[in-house]
């Protein structure tokens, strides 16, 4: 026996109250597959959230961060503040990274300057706060009297950050 | 959509090697870090360590250094987790999860038994 | 590194208030974040960065977080919260992040 509620479209719900006939979704609310006994209530984009997409009576809306956020979890659940490069996050706002560690993204925190010295490299460019060192060839491969820059450079353990 | 797959269920032997795996899609891989997380049986989360992909730079905490090694692959995607030698004290699922202090996603969990 | 303390276990009446505290030394010089876990599942976050509720979280979950402790508030608590909840921290001393033990809640 077929359930009389299979029938009733996306966009639809199966009214127990009236004798199972299939009624619209009510404002704010959405059915997205057929069948179903209930519309789910529309998601709402407040506070640093705002609307992709509106809500329809078939599916629901999306979300995503106002500009200075960006979106983390499913369906952009949750928004986290983005800060420069060359920053980190902390609970007091956006931190310059401390020497020795860079960040060249809007997001995440700051990590440590490479250590050519470990790989028997020497220093071809110095880090900053936006980007890493890079590494050149070994001090043994240069020829004489050429000079490469070579700062003291932290070995590649997480350092203290500012907070 | 964004996943992290991790790979299957192991039983292992006292003293072998392990290498699980966890596969990351539907975003830029290189540029989140990805944690692993210990889960004992009946027990709580403990937090191991992480990894930035785009550099493989890691860090681990205290409790798991030198016990085991994390390290990553962008070009495929997949970081891995690593032992040398396992104990019957490594029995327990361990998942990986995209981030440093908000996971927002988590691998399915893999399994690991050691036992003789 | 920091420690993170939680009651092994909360009890609460169907449409009561359960609340499971998290302390730590200065944990409120940090964000605390909250997850649920339920049997055979990973966990999932129900509160981030002391207070904030990603979405299709129910409203009934709140976070606040000052001095030393952190607490998850689950207000009109319902049978389908029951669950492991753990808070969590990120530390810039040492770049680690920490679990708290966890606390089982148990709906009556």
């Known amino acids: 026996l077929q359930d009389p509620c299979s029938k009733c479209p996306a966009g639809t719900f199966c009214d127990n109250n009236r004798n199972q006939i299939c009624s619209p979704c009510p404002p704010n609310s959405f059915s997205s597959t057929s069948g179903q006994k209930a519309c789910d209530i529309c998601r709402q984009c407040k506070g640093v959230f705002r609307t992709r997409k509106e809500c329809s009576s078939t599916s629901n809306a999306e979300c995503d961060c106002t500009p200075g956020f960006h979106c983390l979890g499913a369906g952009c659940s949750m928004c986290e503040q983005d800060c420069k490069q060359g920053q980190e996050l902390t609970k007091k706002g956006c931190k310059d990274c401390c020497f020795g560690t860079f960040n060249d993204q809007k997001r995440g925190i700051c990590r440590p300057w490479t250590n050519c010295s470990l790989d028997g490299k020497s220093v071809l460019v110095n880090g900053t706060k936006e980007r890493d060192v890079v590494c050149g060839p070994s001090p043994a491969d240069l020829s004489p009297g050429a000079s490469s820059v070579t700062p003291p450079a932290p070995a590649r353990e997480p350092g203290h950050s500012p907070q | 959509q964004v996943q992290l797959v991790q790979s299957g269920a192991e039983v292992k032997k006292p003293g072998e090697s392990l290498k699980i795996s966890c596969k990351g899609s539907?975003?830029?891989?290189?540029?989140?870090?990805i944690s692993w997380v210990r889960q004992m049986p009946g027990k709580g989360l403990e937090w191991m360590g992480k990894?930035?992909?785009?550099?493989?730079?890691?860090n681990y905490s205290p409790s798991f250094q030198g016990q085991v090694t994390i390290s990553a692959d962008k070009s495929i995607s997949t970081a891995y987790l690593q032992w040398s030698s396992l104990k019957a004290s490594d029995t327990a699922m361990y998942y990986c999860?995209?981030?440093?202090?908000?996971?927002?996603?988590w691998g399915q969990g893999t399994l690991v038994t050691v036992s003789s | 590194d920091i420690e993170l303390t939680q009651p092994p276990s909360v009890s609460v009446a169907p449409g009561q208030t359960a609340r499971i505290s998290c302390s730590g030394d200065?944990?409120?010089?940090?964000?605390a974040h909250w997850y649920q876990q339920k049997p055979g599942q990973a966990p999932v976050v129900v509160i981030y960065?002391?207070?904030n509720r990603p979405s299709g979280i129910p409203e009934r979950f709140s976070g606040s977080n000052s001095g030393n402790t952190a607490t998850l508030t689950i207000s009109g608590t319902q049978a389908e919260d029951e669950a492991d909840y753990y808070c969590?921290?990120?530390?810039?001393?040492?770049?680690?992040?920490?679990f708290g033990g966890g606390t089982k809640l148990t709906v009556l």
């Open positions: 999860a995209r981030g440093y202090g908000i996971f927002d996603y």
């Open positions: 539907g975003y830029s891989f290189s540029t989140y870090w």
């Open positions: 990894i930035y992909p785009g550099d493989s730079y890691t």
């Open positions: 200065n944990i409120g010089d940090q964000y």
């Open positions: 960065q002391d207070k």
């Open positions: 969590s921290t990120y530390t810039f001393v040492g770049f680690t992040t920490v």
